[in-house]
Amino acid sequence: PPRGRILGGREAEAHARPYMASVQLNGAHLCGGVLVAEQWVLSAAHCLEDAADGKVQVLLGAHSLSQPEPSKRLYDVLRAVPHPDSQPDTIDHDLLLLQLSEKATLGPAVRPLPWQRVDRDVAPGTLCDVAGWGIVNHAGRRPDSLQHVLLPVLDRATCNRRTHHDGAITERLMCAESNRRDSCKGDSGGPLVCGGVLEGVVTSGSRVCGNRKKPGIYTRVASYAAWIDSVLA
């Protein structure tokens, strides 16, 4: 049986997710991110809450965080643009755009991911891919290589049940099943990819992982298309 990796997942195929980014603070992995344009990485706003004094960088082209790889490159951040409505105490609007110090060098292992612009819910039960370097077990073990898991989308009504997230899931958020397979701490800011398209970003609120009554929460990128476009313009 799977031994964690994300939670309940496995090691990803190396460099098969060329859009995948590691947002780093003082040289250590902090959050996931996704390359959405040559010079822009999308992540979660809460990731930078405690990063005021540290150096934020973005690692692209990586599979292993520690091993040398020809495609790996660490980029400085020119500017960080959190969504203007994001707040420390809510999961709403939990998006962050990071402008790299220069355009990323694109290649087979570094390439932006198309993101969903049609503001329509993903059908429940659709299997979506989540990847990250987040913890792989409840003891908090961090992987060196990228992990991934396929998760079914959960309908909003179920996710909003009193026993689950009790009405907190707005139309700008979506949920995925969390029954032993789940995204977890350190995966925040990473991509939820459905049918090869970016549909969601892992929110960075504190949440118990792998408990089916507490589904994973993801920010729907299509709901923020106007904001993303305005920042990237």
Epitope: P1, P2, G8, R10, E11, A12, E13, A16, R17, P114, V118, V122, A123, P124, G125, T126, L127, D129, A131, H148, L150, P152, V153, E177, N179, R180, R181, V193, C194, G195, G196, V197, R212
Partner: antibody, heavy 121, light 106 residues
């Protein structure tokens, strides 16, 4: 390479139920979703649903809700599909299929051998 | 649900010819998968995510397309290519297949 071995052909009477099996050849059975697909006469392929052997989470095509039930036995690395209230419309070849890769572009890279179900009085 | 329509239903061509079959979706699909099936056998993965050849698939096959129109092309037809080809979308549950294109060799 992983193989999915399905149970043999079934001849069943209308109104009855049938349970067909799909056994994975390797021991990483719980790591991968198991899907079921119906191929009826005229070669039409219909996705029935999937089950996650790791946690029992399943999803069905609305068309097959109440008709098919998916289960697994982790100890024998076997997935099952039960089809109830059989009619001639259920006569078909049924396949289990899975994705054993780890890229984000999942597809059915492994298919079972197929089980022919014939409904006839 | 997303409906996939394949055309032509039957395609007859001679060895060495270039052939293209089409899969049209009722709504936009970013990536399409294709499977090959020969009589009496299970379907085989053939092209995944629109343009990637599955393991063991000859380089004369290619896939292309975006949105609602996707294509499978064989640059130089060979006798062993006779089969039925199905497209499949995986963007949205329920996952759906096209009705198939039966490729016959003259």
């Amino acid at each position: 390479e992983v193989q999915l071995q399905q149970s043999g052909p079934e001849l069943v009477k209308p109104g009855a139920s049938v349970k067909i099996s799909c056994k994975a050849s390797d021991n990483s059975f719980t790591g991968y979703y198991m899907h079921w697909v119906k191929q009826s006469h005229g070669n039409i392929l219909d996705w029935i649903g999937y089950i996650d052997p790791y946690n029992g989470v399943s999803s069905y095509n609305q068309k097959f809700k109440g008709k098919a039930t998916l289960t697994v036995d982790k100890s024998s690395s076997t997935a099952y599909m039960e089809i109830r209230s059989l009619t001639s419309e259920d006569s078909a070849v049924y396949y289990c299929a899975s994705y054993y890769g780890s890229s984000p572009y999942w597809y059915f890279d492994v298919w079972g051998t197929g089980t022919t179900v014939t409904v006839s009085s | 649900q997303i409906v996939l329509s394949q055309s032509p239903a039957i395609l007859s061509a001679s060895p060495g010819e270039k052939v293209t079959m089409t899969c049209r979706a009722s709504s936009s699909v970013s990536y399409m998968h294709w499977y090959q099936q020969k009589p009496g056998s299970s379907p085989k993965p053939w092209i995944y995510a629109t343009s990637n050849l599955a393991s063991g698939v000859p380089a004369r096959f290619s896939g292309s397309g975006s949105g609602t129109s996707h294509f499978l092309t064989i640059s130089r037809l060979e006798a062993e290519d006779a089969a039925t080809y199905f497209c499949q979308q995986w963007s949205s549950n329920p996952y759906t297949f096209g009705g198939g294109t039966k490729l016959e060799i003259k």
